[in-house]
Interface confidence: low
């Protein structure tokens, strides 16, 4: 680390003094000051003097000597006072510019230590500080406005007592820039927009910033509109604002309008699309399938997709039957808003029932008349199956119906002993029905069709099973022949019941 | 059955712009919103943005404003995205994915593209 | 902006048995009754794909295994029983408030 002699950290001198300041280090050594007149500087290797013969108050201030090839970029510093009765400030800087919330410097120092007592900062003709400035002082570097705000971008004197009365500074300019984190926030409303050729609409682009420099403008397509702009400041943050009134709009209004604004920190900008159409429009669609099946006892969303202009009056969910009078909950039903032209509409049927099979219409109005969609909604069913022993042209025949959802498909087991249900150990036939008689096929009603079996003996230790299945599950009726005549027995596993 | 074919791999200077494109078939192309998803290698995915092609409407994550264009072309079925300035943050796969009105999920994606950012 | 916390970050789990991946979002939503919930499997090279959407409805083709639940702020993917075909990265997404964002991811390995 240099050394500076004398060794003292403060010297007090009078006007027209002569001051010698030495520094010597290990290397080269380099002085570091105020700008001020009458210094000499000697270099001489590893020492450097610092000389005048006329001290000046100007030549007050901090010293300090640096060793350049010192890796430790160590220093010492010395600070001289030049004691001036009729000065006692050395201002080095008349402006001083700093960001909002930084301390800020009003770099006014002291000629003569003994005045420190008696130091004030003022506002320029003697006017108070603002309210809330926080401030100190340090006779070596002048006063610091604490964490400084753009209000407090004012000027400013130092004012010592000497004698009993104020003695000031000249004046130093204190600029506040505010911090612009970026460039300005942007607003463009709405942010779509659809009218009917002839009708009034409004678009507003706004712009806000802590700053006052920043443009703003709204562009339709690529060219820039003359529109009048209105300025307004609150919350702190001054406001600019296009409004685009058009009173009767045309298809050439159409298209995409940008709102753009800039300041130092950079461009934002924000696009909306205007459409201009003949009439209004209504238009129902869907990203489902308008014929829906489901097994019974699971649910359904039904969802309908609107895109309207202008907005719809009316809308509802109606059950068009077959089976029951019933109209869906509105509680069963929901809406949501994409924007303001779009929209989703959603039914919600859970664990649907037998009589909730059928078509279900969403119907929507607005000044471009109604709409509707409808969903044909068909359940399905397991098989249910029961078999009866009667003579068809008089011969013995096994009679066995089965109803479900989709058509079921038919097969018929002989087996020995007398059981539930046919194991394959105990299988001696087996016949498939590929083509059952069809006995109802109504819209949204289960299929029942008729498998018939001709039986020339029934044997009585034996079982006769009709099994039926769909692709939703099976059913079956074990037909046992006992002496007494036909016994059936349907396994409770397989009854079905919704 | 729903499609979308995106364009091959891009390798790309800095400061470059690129465009992708992402085809869509097998439904009503003007119905249904086609998003933007960006994946970094080895991590998560970020919504970058959406275009509606029944007008070209577009809605973007404000991360990705003025870094990203969305635009459409109905009459080849066509949606693009436009990156500008690229830096290395932009090298990663880009998806294109399809999603019906509001809440609906993003039930078909494209293959991705891979966009390499280097000098 | 909605954030989506997803846990655990990986986990292992054995063959046939129950894995269970959690989504915290940081506020609550629930739009006109519906929540903007879904949820993708990833595996690498290839775009998500959709398995659970709106909370719990099992996307089209996907298998049973696979279920959602929760609401609010709170939601879980179940795989009962975990499959080999399973390992991938399983996401969380939010489509009720812009912008639509998605979880961190959960790396599923089996042991």
């Known amino acids: 680390i240099p050394v500076i002699e004398p060794s003292v950290p403060e010297l007090v001198v009078k006007p027209g003094a002569t001051v010698t300041l030495r520094c010597v280090g290990n290397g080269s050594v380099e002085w570091d000051g105020p700008p001020s007149p009458h210094w000499t500087l000697y270099s001489d290797g590893s020492s450097s003097i610092l000389s005048t013969n006329n001290a000046t108050f100007q030549n007050t201030g901090t010293y300090r000597c640096t060793e350049p090839g010192d890796p430790l970029g160590g220093s010492a510093a010395i600070h001289l006072y030049v004691k001036d009765p009729a000065r006692p400030w050395n201002v080095l800087a008349q402006e001083v510019v700093v960001f909002e919330d930084q301390d800020a410097l009003l770099p006014c120092l002291l000629t003569d230590p003994v005045l420190e007592a008696g130091v004030s900062l003022v506002r320029v003709r003697g006017r108070p500080l603002m309210r809330h400035t926080n401030y100190s002082f340090s006779p070596w570097h002048g006063f610091t406005i604490h964490r400084a705000k753009f209000i407090q971008s004012q000027d400013y004197q130092c004012s010592a007592l000497m004698g009993g009365r104020k003695v000031m500074s000249i004046s130093i300019r204190l600029k506040v820039q505010k911090v612009i984190p970026g460039p300005p926030a942007l607003t463009l409303v709405p942010a779509e927009l659809v009218r009917i050729r002839g009708e009034a609409a409004q678009i507003v682009c706004s712009a806000s910033s802590v700053d006052v420099n920043f443009d703003v403008f709204l562009q339709h397509n690529n060219t820039k509109l003359a529109i009048p702009q209105q300025s307004d400041f609150h919350n702190n943050r001054y406001q600019k604002v296009l409004t685009l009134n058009l009173d009767q709009v045309d298809f050439q209004h159409a298209g995409n309008y940008s709102c753009v604004a800039s300041n130092v920190q950079g461009k934002h900008s924000t696009s909306m699309f205007f459409r201009v159409v003949e009439s209004a429009y209504l238009n129902l669609s869907s990203e489902q399938n308008l014929i829906q099946e489901v097994t019974v006892g699971e649910g359904l969303n039904l969802k309908v997709m609107v895109e309207a202009y202008p907005g719809l009056q009316g809308f509802n969910w109606t059950y068009l039957g077959p089976f029951s009078d019933h109209q869906p909950e509105p509680k069963l039903a929901n809406a949501t808003t994409k924007d303001t032209y779009r929209h989703t509409f959603t039914l919600s049927l859970p664990r649907l029932k037998p009589s909730e099979a059928g078509r279900y219409s969403f119907l929507a109005r607005n000044p471009g008349g109604w709409r509707a969609l409808t969903f044909e909604l068909t359940l399905r069913y397991p098989p249910e199956v029961s078999v009866i022993w009667t003579f068809i042209n008089g011969s013995g025949t096994l009679l066995c119906a089965a109803s479900g959802y989709p058509q079921p498909n038919v097969t018929w087991l002989q087996c020995s002993g007398h059981t539930d249900r046919c194991d394959e150990a105990q299988v001696l036939q087996v016949w498939d029905d590929p083509y059952p008689e069809v006995l109802s096929q109504e819209p949204f009603h289960k299929v029942t069709v008729q498998s018939l079996l001709t039986v020339e003996t029934l044997e009585h230790n034996q079982t006769y099973e009709c099994r039926a299945h769909n692709s939703v599950g099976s059913g079956s009726w074990a037909f046992i022949p006992i002496s007494a005549g036909a016994h059936t027995h349907p396994p409770d596993e397989f009854l079905f019941t919704p | 059955q729903v499609q979308l074919q995106q364009s091959g791999p891009e390798l790309v200077k800095p400061g470059a712009s690129v465009k992708l494109s992402c085809k869509a078939s097998g439904y009503t192309f003007t119905t249904y919103d086609i998003n933007w998803v960006k994946q970094r290698p080895g991590q998560g995915l970020e919504w970058i943005g959406w275009v509606y092609p029944r007008d070209g409407s577009t809605k973007y994550n404000e991360k990705f404003k003025g870094k990203a264009t969305l635009t459409v072309d109905t009459s080849s079925r066509t949606v693009y995205m436009e990156f500008h300035s690229l830096t290395s943050e932009d090298s990663a796969v880009y998806f294109c994915a399809r999603s019906g009105l509001t809440g609906s999920p993003f039930a078909y994606w494209g293959q991705g593209t891979l966009v390499t950012v280097s000098a | 902006k909605i954030v989506l916390t997803q846990s655990p970050a990986s986990l292992a789990v054995s063959l046939r048995q129950r894995a269970t991946i959690s989504c915290r979002a940081s506020?609550?939503?629930?739009?006109?009754?519906?929540?903007?919930m879904h949820w993708f499997q990833q595996k690498s090279g290839q775009p998500p794909k959709l398995l659970i959407y709106?909370?719990?409805n099992l996307e089209s083709g996907v298998p049973a295994r696979f279920s959602g639940s929760g609401s609010r702020t709170d939601f879980t993917l179940t795989i009962d029983p975990v499959e080999a075909d399973d390992a991938a990265t399983y996401y969380c997404?939010?489509?009720?408030?812009?912008?639509?964002?998605f979880g961190s991811g959960t790396k599923l390995e089996l042991k």
């Open positions: 709106r909370a719990s």
């Open positions: 506020e609550s939503f629930d739009s006109y009754g519906n929540t903007f």
């Open positions: 997404q939010q489509n009720n408030e812009y912008p639509l964002t």
